[in-house]
């Protein structure tokens, strides 16, 4: 058993049928010695008396808010949560496996640049009685500071019969140098509590590996005289690290017909312009990627050919 | 400790081409190592990230773009002194700090070259003959060093009398390649910045 926060405790249980559970001793936070009784949640049934209460915690029915009283007055509370260990592996019931980039990916994180700011998100089908708390650091043995905000519900989607909820959090490394070569990964730890179930999820990454630039901005077409060709031009996104000559991007320009089956023409360039043939009803899209370290491509920025 | 925005002569930068070749070569070599050594801990998540140049060179700090010198987090560097004179510096106007940056890059390359050559000698003794260093990568390191053309003491190749532990050598190769790829990215950024300056 360990303390998650004041008066909230997590009991770790080896979870299998007929398991013996864990013996837990609760102590009433009071100078009083006599006349103390204990109850669980809203029940008025007295579970025991005295300054300490010994319980055998086996299932969720044994978890909850234990309260010690004296003469009708509440003295203190202890909330017990359960953390299930199933055959040596901590349960992952609360969050959905996003399966990207690999199986057992519960937290996904992205950064728009090298400033040390990043966003993480996760999915769940649970709509109520759910709380999250996020901590982060650079490295784990001698951790350096990363400050995270509060997790917020960022999207709701309908997936088949189920509703899916996306939560996200923004974090910022306290003293980040965009040019630094990372040798210690960022660690992100999410505590999730659903009713009386506690779970924790972690992700470890280098900022360089989670970079996903914003799409190029100011995408424009300039028709070339007496030609079906157009000059496409664009700019680096505002959110990208500067100077751009140091933090360079490479670009992919795509001409896509109306039909998804039509052949896509693609050009790769380090410049911020390209000359392409604009077909009728086609659209031109451009996306960006760090020129020197192949992390994710940005989303496409698009303009119609007409 | 930073790069001023110099205005060098047109087409001054032969090093840019070499640094791009270097990044391509080390990335290919790392990919090959990850595939060949699939039963070894060779992914970024599994290895310890060690920098053999730590406390010996300070490339990131010495080559910091001028725009980042206002960022205090970028200025916690160690002071290191370097020999200066190099053929990539095609302009007399190029500052002392730029020379310091390029000599730091040269020292990095020299240290990695020695490590890779020592490692290759060990890998050639492996009866499994599972993996060797790409000669193209070693050649590209050499080309960039020649383009930088700094006078520097030659570092003798390390020789070891004891029987090599091939498992450890292959893991060390992975560690070295990951670190060298990161340094090659920095070198490419620096060359791109200098070329644009």
């Amino acid at each position: 058993i360990w303390e998650l926060k004041k008066d909230v405790y997590v009991v770790e249980l080896d979870w299998y049928p007929d398991a013996p559970g864990e013996m837990v001793v609760l102590t009433c936070d009071t100078p009083e010695e006599d006349g103390i009784t204990w109850t669980l949640d809203q029940s008025s049934e007295v579970l025991g008396s005295g300054k300490t209460l010994t319980i055998q915690v086996k299932e969720f029915g044994d978890a909850g808010q234990y309260t010690c009283h004296k003469g009708g007055e509440v003295l203190s509370h202890s909330l017990l949560l359960l953390h299930k260990k199933e055959d040596g592996i901590w349960s992952t019931d609360i969050l959905k496996d996003q399966k990207e980039p690999k199986n057992k990916t519960f937290l996904r994180c992205e950064a728009k640049n090298y400033s040390g700011r990043f966003t993480c998100w996760w999915l769940t089908t649970i709509s109520t009685d759910l709380t999250f708390s996020v901590k982060s650091s650079r490295g784990s043995s001698d951790p350096q500071g990363v400050t995270c905000g509060a997790a917020t519900l960022s999207a709701e989607r309908v997936r088949g019969d189920n509703k899916e909820y996306e939560y996200s959090v923004e974090c910022q490394e306290d003293s980040a140098c965009p040019a630094a070569e990372e040798s210690l990964p960022i660690e992100v730890m999410v505590d999730a509590v659903h009713k009386l179930k506690y779970e924790n999820y972690t992700s470890s990454f280098f900022i360089r590996d989670i970079i996903k630039p914003d799409p190029p901005k100011n995408l424009q077409l300039k028709p070339l005289k007496n030609s079906r060709q157009v000059e496409v031009s664009w700019e680096y996104p505002d959110t990208w690290s500067t100077p751009h000559s140091y933090f360079s991007l490479t670009f992919c320009v795509q001409v896509q017909g109306k039909s998804k089956r039509e052949k896509k023409d693609r050009v790769f360039t380090d410049k911020t312009s390209a000359t392409v043939i604009c077909r009728k009803n086609a659209s031109i899209s451009v996306r960006a990627q760090d020129r020197y370290y192949s992390s994710s491509w940005s989303e496409w920025a698009s303009v119609p050919c007409s | 400790r930073n790069l001023p925005v110099a205005t060098p002569d047109p087409g001054m930068f032969p090093c840019l081409h070499h640094s791009q070749n270097l990044l391509r070569a080390v990335s290919n070599m790392l990919q090959k190592a990850r595939q060949t050594l699939e039963f070894y801990p060779c992914t970024s998540e599994e290895i310890d990230h060690e920098d053999i140049t730590k406390d010996k060179t300070s490339t990131v700090e010495a080559c910091l773009p001028l725009e980042l010198t206002k960022n205090e987090s970028c200025l916690n560097s160690r002071e290191t002194s370097f020999i200066t004179n190099g053929s990539c510096l095609a302009s007399r106007k190029t500052s002392f700090m730029m020379a310091l940056c390029l000599s730091s890059i040269y020292e990095d390359l020299k240290m990695y070259q020695v490590e890779f050559k020592t490692m290759n000698a060990k890998l050639l003794m492996d009866p499994k003959r599972q993996i060797f260093l790409d000669q193209n990568m070693l050649a590209v390191i050499d080309e960039l060093m020649q383009a930088l053309n700094f006078n520097s003491e030659t570092v003798p190749q390390k020789s070891s009398l004891e029987e090599p532990d091939f498992y450890k050598t292959k893991i060390k190769l992975c560690i070295l390649l990951h670190a060298f790829r990161i340094r090659a990215v920095t070198i490419d950024r620096v060359m791109s910045y200098l070329n644009a300056s």
Partner: antibody, heavy 115, light 111 residues
């Protein structure tokens, strides 16, 4: 006392269907994940499928994906394995088992796919 | 489809020490715990070892398990006639959990 009692096995022709049941008693069935494991005659153990305690997630071996469906009825304390498009290679003793560091197995039920 | 490899058979005379190996990889045994089962002819498997080296109550202390890196082993010190059976190791793979990964199985013969 934890008990898993299996039923539903038998002889079936290729291409036909069969449903196995596993009745649980002696524990809070709705709190635990459950597996199906099979063993072809003279062969080793092969995992078939898993279902979460609340039925929200199901996992299958590649060899049965799209043909077999694992399900549970927590009100009846029963686990099921619906087997469709049966093949000769599905011939095996099928076991249900609880998920956890200490597990309990059903007695097994023989499924023979033969024309 | 078996990722965990066991020797097909091992044998020993009564009182001898018999060991069965179970070889896996970094993503399964390297990352997860190992169980060992005993299966007597015509019966369901019986759990002998869980959590690499833990014995459930009722399992004789002549059975012991260990794990090192990407391999595990089961030792029977002082093998007895009633130990003649098939033995299976079991673990999980990081990417496919909760799918059970079983070893190929080992027939133990007491001479």
């Amino acid at each position: 006392q934890v008990q898993l009692v299996q039923s539903g096995g038998g002889v079936v022709q290729p291409g036909r269907s069969l449903r196995l049941s596993c009745a649980a008693s002696g524990f809070t069935f709705s709190s635990y994940g459950m597996h199906w494991v099979r063993q072809a005659p003279g062969k080793g153990l092969e995992w078939v499928a898993f279902i979460r305690y609340d039925g929200s997630n199901k996992y299958y071996a590649d060899s049965v994906k799209g043909r077999f469906t694992i399900s549970r009825d927590n009100s009846k304390n029963t686990l099921y394995l619906q087997m469709k498009s049966l093949r000769a290679e599905d011939t095996a003793v099928y076991y249900c088992k609880t998920h956890g560091s200490h597990d309990n197995w059903g007695q097994g039920t023989m499924v023979t796919v033969s024309s | 489809s078996y990722v965990l490899t066991q020797p097909p058979s091992v044998s020993g005379t009564p009182g001898q020490r018999v060991t069965i190996s179970c070889s896996g990889g970094r993503s399964n045994i390297g990352k997860n715990t190992v169980k060992w089962y005993q299966q007597l002819p015509g019966t369901a498997p019986k759990l002998l070892i869980y959590g690499n080296d833990q014995r459930p109550s009722g399992v004789p202390d002549r059975f012991s398990g260990s794990k090192s890196g990407t391999s595990a082993s089961l030792a029977i010190t002082g093998v007895q006639a009633e130990d003649e059976a098939d033995y299976y190791c079991q673990s999980y793979d990081r990417g496919t959990h909760p799918a059970l990964l079983f070893g190929t199985g080992t027939k133990v013969t007491v001479l």
